[in-house]
Interface confidence: medium
């Protein structure tokens, strides 16, 4: 057993060396080790094949060190590894895309607080067993296409506290089992209408504290299991383009955050969900650092990520709401409620923890994938109940005289709910 470490065999063969001031991975780690705890040291480099002899290793904690470099082959031979915690290594900044290749049994990967600026192509390739991926509190600016494509068993993806400015079409492709997606505290101004296409099992979506002024209803349509959505702390523009989002929220019966309006000024601070339909009139004209939203440009969107308010044909001018004009029976807002049956109610009153699935199931060390969280996953906190079906939001065809509220690349539909503890 290395000098700074404590080694023991029960309940698992363990080499434990936390907070010992180690500057390198110690030599002489017993080959039979199933758990290695090296957190809280001063290790700056993980050389290739550092743990190659430890074929039975299932848990490796390297968090809270000063890692600046991890060789691409650092974890070679660790075919049984289930938990890898590299979090809180702010100098790391980048990880070679081959670093995690071969870790076919990995179910929990912590890369939070690592100063990561980008996710290299293929970084998570082959991690078919991964269920929990922690990427929060980094410096990520973009979500490259197909980054998570192989993660078909991923249930929790933490991306909050980064610098992500948009959610492109293929960002979350392949995440068919995802239950929880945390994107709050980023700089998201635009969500592609098809960004959430594969997320049919998503129950929790956090988008609060971003730069969203609108959200395409089409993006929310695939979220059939959605229960919790937080949209607060965004610069929502509550004009005619917010109608689909408003309508969706009226139907949604889960638990949702407030959606406070930023514009127009007369509605600033008010919750979109609590507005009346005729409050959402015309097109707000932004002032100050924002660009005017009502323009004749040919693009589908304004710089804020809002759909453009369309200029009608001359004959249809009377059917378009201009700022300040009251809604009338013949205006372009008529019929804007997305079709679809109302979702079933979830009952009134608070849900009680001890009656919930996670509140009663034991946290077994080797549970079935579908039942209980595996060892190394995040705690249930206040657990969620079983999935409730949500209606898909389809869109009606719209004539040229209508604002293209629900079309691809435009509009502002939203959904949902959130519960946070």
């Amino acid at each position: 057993c290395p000098g700074a470490c404590v080694c023991y065999n029960e309940p698992k063969v363990t080499t434990s060396c936390p907070q010992q001031g180690l500057q390198a991975v110690p030599v002489g780690i017993p080959a039979a080790s199933q758990r290695i705890f090296l957190h809280g040291n001063r290790i700056s480099h993980v050389p290739a094949a550092s743990f190659r002899a430890c074929r039975n290793l299932t848990i490796l904690w390297l968090h809270s060190n000063v890692l600046a470099r991890i060789d691409a082959a650092a974890f070679t031979g660790l075919a049984l590894l289930e938990q890898l915690d590299l979090s809180d290594n702010a100098q790391l900044r980048s990880v070679d895309p081959a670093t995690f290749h071969g870790l076919g049994r990995l179910h929990t990967l912590h890369l939070d607080r690592c100063g990561l600026q980008e996710l290299g192509p293929g970084l998570f390739r082959g991690l078919a067993a991964l269920q929990y991926l922690y990427l929060q509190d980094n410096a990520l600016q973009a979500l490259p296409d197909d980054t998570f494509r192989d993660l078909g068993n991923l249930t929790h993806l933490f991306l909050h506290g980064n610098r992500i400015s948009s959610v492109p079409e293929r960002a979350f492709r392949g995440l068919h089992s995802l239950d929880r997606l945390l994107l709050h505290q980023n700089r998201v101004a635009h969500v592609h209408p098809h960004a959430f296409r594969d997320l049919g099992r998503l129950m929790t979506l956090y988008l609060f504290a971003n730069n969203l002024s609108a959200l395409p209803t089409e993006a929310l349509a695939p979220l059939r299991a959605l229960q919790y959505l937080r949209l607060n702390d965004n610069p929502w523009v509550c004009d005619c383009r917010a109608r689909p989002l408003w309508a969706w929220l009226q139907k949604f019966r889960g638990s949702s955050s407030e959606v406070p309006c930023s514009l127009p000024q007369r509605l600033a601070g008010r919750d979109l969900k609590r507005l009346a339909a005729n409050d959402l009139q015309g097109c707000a004209v932004a002032t100050g650092p924002y660009h005017p939203i009502w323009t004749g440009r040919a693009t589908d969107e304004e710089p804020l990520g809002l759909p453009k308010c369309c200029q009608p044909d001359a004959a249809d001018k009377a059917s378009v709401l201009e700022p300040g004009r009251p809604a009338s029976a013949g205006n372009a807002l008529k019929g804007r409620v997305p079709p679809g049956d109302s979702p079933p109610g979830n009952g009134s009153g608070p849900r009680h923890i001890n009656d919930s699935p996670f509140g009663t199931l034991p946290g077994s060390a080797e549970p079935p994938l579908t039942a209980v969280r595996p060892e190394g996953s995040e705690p249930p906190g206040f657990p969620t109940s079983g999935p409730r079906r949500r209606p898909g939001c389809s869109r009606k065809n719209r004539t040229r005289s209508h604002c293209r509220l629900g079309q691809a690349g435009s509009g502002g539909g939203g959904t949902g709910d959130s519960e946070g503890s």
């Epitope: 936390p18 923890i353 946290g363 060390a365 060892e375 996953s377 519960e419 503890s421």
Partner: antibody, heavy 124, light 107 residues
Framework: QMQLVQSGGGLEQPGRSLRLSCVTS????????MHWVRQAPGKGLEWVSG????????GYADSVKGRFTVSRDNSKNSLYLQMNSLRAEDTAVYYC?????????????????WGQGTLVTVSS | DIQMTQSPSSVSASVGDRVTITCRAS??????LSWYQQKPGKAPKLLIY???NLQSGVPLRFSGSGSGTDFTLTINSLQPEDSATYYC?????????FGQGTKVEIK
């Protein structure tokens, strides 16, 4: 700085009621679950109850279920514990605590801030 | 409910000694265990969260490890101000439960 200020404790007879309050400041109360933990004289800590940020989930220890009710008012940054049908064994110092958990951090942090505690004595 | 069993119930050690407190859960709780320090008449103070993560401001002589059912809190070089009662708490399943406490005294 962060503060959790408790009130409402005191002496009460068995079978009667008391309401504890915990007023917070220095953080965004809306974003956190909150808990009540108690400690009987000379004994250890016992988790009593917890409530999620939006009151959508609520939990109780078996020993208080059906008698105690936890609630919160986010507009007042306040947490409450309504204690009915008090028993002698409810005598304890009651603490409110903030739960800095994964719903906002993505990573569990335990009960990172606590109130000063308020003594509840149940005696005839 | 998940039972948490701490051992020893009390320990007396000298300044500079290494003190180890163990906590065993009655069923697997993954990493979801916190450690608290409480001094007489004061509210508990969070030391370690998620089994091994040191809470901000806590001295480096405190460390935690373990996963599943067996957990350890280690005080590497005991200081006079470490005289207190230490509690583990599982946060894996509701209701959350605490261990019965370990009283650490300075010889």
């Amino acid at each position: 700085q962060m503060q959790l200020v408790q009130s409402g404790g005191g002496l009460e007879q068995p079978g009667r009621s008391l309401r504890l309050s915990c007023v917070t400041s220095g953080f965004n109360f809306n974003d956190y679950a909150m808990h009540w933990v108690r400690q009987a004289p000379g004994k250890g800590l016992e988790w009593v109850s917890g409530i999620s940020w939006n009151s959508g989930a609520i939990g109780y220890a078996d020993s208080v279920k059906g008698r105690f009710t936890v609630s919160r008012d986010n507009s007042k940054n306040s947490l409450y514990l309504q204690m009915n049908s008090l028993r002698a064994e409810d005598t304890a110092v009651y603490y409110c605590a903030r739960d800095y958990n994964y719903e906002t951090s993505g990573y569990y942090h335990g009960f990172d801030n606590w109130g000063q505690g308020t003594l509840v004595t149940v005696s005839s | 409910d998940i039972q948490m069993t701490q051992s020893p119930s009390s320990v007396s050690a000298s300044v500079g000694d290494r003190v180890t407190i163990t906590c065993r859960a009655s069923q697997g709780i993954s990493r979801w265990l916190s450690w608290y320090q409480q001094k007489p008449g004061k509210a508990p103070k969070l030391l370690i969260y998620a089994a091994s993560n040191l809470q901000s401001g806590v001295p480096l002589r405190f460390s935690g490890s373990g996963s599943g059912t067996d957990f350890t809190l280690t005080i590497n070089s005991l200081q006079p101000e470490d005289s207190a009662t230490y509690y583990c708490q599982q946060t894996n399943n509701f209701p959350y439960t605490f261990g019965q406490g370990t009283k650490v005294e300075i010889k």
